[in-house]
Interface confidence: medium
Amino acid sequence: FPQDRPFEDTCHGNPSHYYDKAVRRCCYRCPMGLFPTQQCPQRPTDCRKQCEPDYYLDEADRCTACVTCSRDDLVEKTPCAWNSSRVCECRPGMFCSTSAVNSCARCFFHSVCPAGMIVKFPGTAQKNTVCEPASPGVSPACASPENCKEPSSGTIPQAKPTPVSPATSSASTMPVRGGTRLAQEAASKLTRAPDSPSSVGRPSSDPGLSPTQPCPEGSGDCRKQCEPDYYLDEAGRCTACVSCSRDDLVEKTPCAWNSSRTCECRPGMICATSATNSCARCVPYPICAAETVTKPQDMAEKDTTFEAPPLGTQPDCNPTPENGEAPASTSPTQSLLVDSQASKTLPIPTSAPVALSSTGKPVLDAG
């Protein structure tokens, strides 16, 4: 476009800027070691240090590990972002009794209101159930909290919570069958055997039934409870949440009890091929500064279960310089892929191929 020439010319001779044809404007060139936070940075504050996956840039400008939510009594509330840690909270049916930075050190099961009492305030991830005396017209046999919610005044006794600790856990607090064993497992989290991290564990075809809170006789408030990184689908089956562990993806919404995690392309990339709750193929914004572009290579490792599709090269983009070396500095046009998990096989010898689910749980790979 001839009308763009004056704008383009203003970039030439200014080593701190380059011209971006896609947005038709001058962009600030991030110094070596810094990464653009947007497609066309305008000023130094639009550049930042880049951290590896599962790390975030803290206030002191250091890459710091995001907290993990791998204990089975925790779920991810907000994902690990470039400038903030992952946040964990107690999973449904539990509340936090001892908080920790971005997480909870100790979760307890929501208590069940005893006979003659009804739920005034249902338990949340932060607070236990609050009970109050039942109205005279309400039958004490009405055990289901959902069916017993009637406004009433009076004192509000706090029901005694069921702690998640070896001393107080008991199998009677919830059904124990299938692969879940949540009552005992939740109890064992603080004393877990060193080589059995909760994020790498038992494949389970039947995750079992667990209530949102311990389920009294006659209660309708029992739903199937899935293991971490699984959700209850419309058919009532525990289904693995999608994984955003490919590093051209970021988590948009976390894995919840009734909905999958959703992934989207990370900043600086757009989705070329969509997939359920995710993107099968992210490509960099189609912009290139000829002197700084690295042509993305195909990632093809045929014997692995998770295979990142090849990244498309963009129009008007020059390939890597003759020697093929990627420079140690970055430019606004390079993809934001860091350490993407295209290959996910456990470092253990097995006779059958073993792959990892989004949780890192081994699953036999039939293919």
């Epitope: 990632m299 970055t330 295209a342 456990l346 470092p347």
Partner: antibody, heavy 123, light 107 residues
Framework: EVQLQESGGGLVQPGGSLRLSCAAS????????IHWVRQAPGKGLEWVSY????????DYNQNFKGRFTTSANKSKNTAYLQMNSLRAEDTAVYYC????????????????WGQGTLVTVSS | DIELTQSPSSLSASVGDRVTITCKAS??????VAWYQQKPGKAPKVLIY???YRYSGVPSRFSGSGSGTDFTLTISSLQPEDFATYYC?????????FGQGTKLEIK
């Protein structure tokens, strides 16, 4: 099988330069960051730098920023550590290592290491 | 930078002994600590990650514990092949740092 092999070490005079190579095999090179860790004779381990072969992004221990530069050649599955203005105290075995991919979280501990290459800075 | 201080710097023990090595961080590192074993002329080998999780193939006599600032590597019953130097590493915050090492020698 994941394998990392360093080369390029040797004797160099103070103020001189050297480029170390780390040839990777057994995994998709662009999938993992490659780190450099060094160990002076009879001393402990010291993290130097890492390179993301996919984007070319690097980060450094402040002690080495400016003198050391990491790069990668994706077509050769090789990472490099360019060391300039070498001093006697840079004498060490230099290892390249690959970060973990284990379980749900991807943190930077090292299950895979090369055998190391010795760099001696002496006049 | 986060400093890791290992103690003792060296110790002598016999086959069958129970040995404990500690690693103290200068600030909270959560459970983001790994332990390595290194033999002369060889690269380090990871034993423990996330403070207490044994890496695949590591014998069960090795165990790790701790969180925050204090971490421990325990070898429950020393075997001849365990005589080596042990390092802790924090991967909580960059730059990544290692302890100065603990040399385990035969008594």
């Amino acid at each position: 099988e994941v394998q990392l092999q360093e080369s390029g070490g040797g004797l160099v005079q103070p103020g001189g330069s050297l480029r170390l190579s780390c040839a990777a095999s057994g995994f998709t090179f662009t999938t993992y960051t490659i780190h450099w860790v060094r160990q002076a004779p009879g001393k402990g381990l010291e993290w130097v730098s890492y390179i993301n072969p996919s984007s070319g992004y690097s980060d450094y221990n402040q002690n080495f920023k400016g003198r050391f530069t990491t790069s990668a050649n994706k077509s050769k599955n090789t990472a490099y550590l360019q060391m300039n203005s070498l001093r006697a105290e840079d004498t060490a075995v230099y290892y390249c290592a690959r970060r973990a991919d284990y379980g749900n979280y991807k943190y930077t501990w090292f299950p895979y290491w090369g055998q190391g290459t010795l760099v001696t800075v002496s006049s | 930078d986060i400093e890791l201080t290992q103690s003792p710097s060296s110790l002598s023990a016999s086959v069958g002994d129970r040995v404990t090595i500690t690693c103290k961080a200068s600030q909270n590192v959560g459970t983001n600590v790994a332990w390595y074993q290194q033999k002369p002329g060889k690269a380090p080998k990871v034993l423990i990650y996330s403070a207490s999780y044994r890496y695949s193939g590591v014998p069960s006599r090795f165990s790790g514990s701790g969180s925050g600032t204090d971490f421990t590597l325990t070898i429950s019953s020393l075997q001849p092949e365990d005589f080596a130097t042990y390092y802790c590493q924090q991967y909580h915050t960059y730059p990544l740092t290692f302890g100065q090492g603990t040399k385990l020698e035969i008594k």
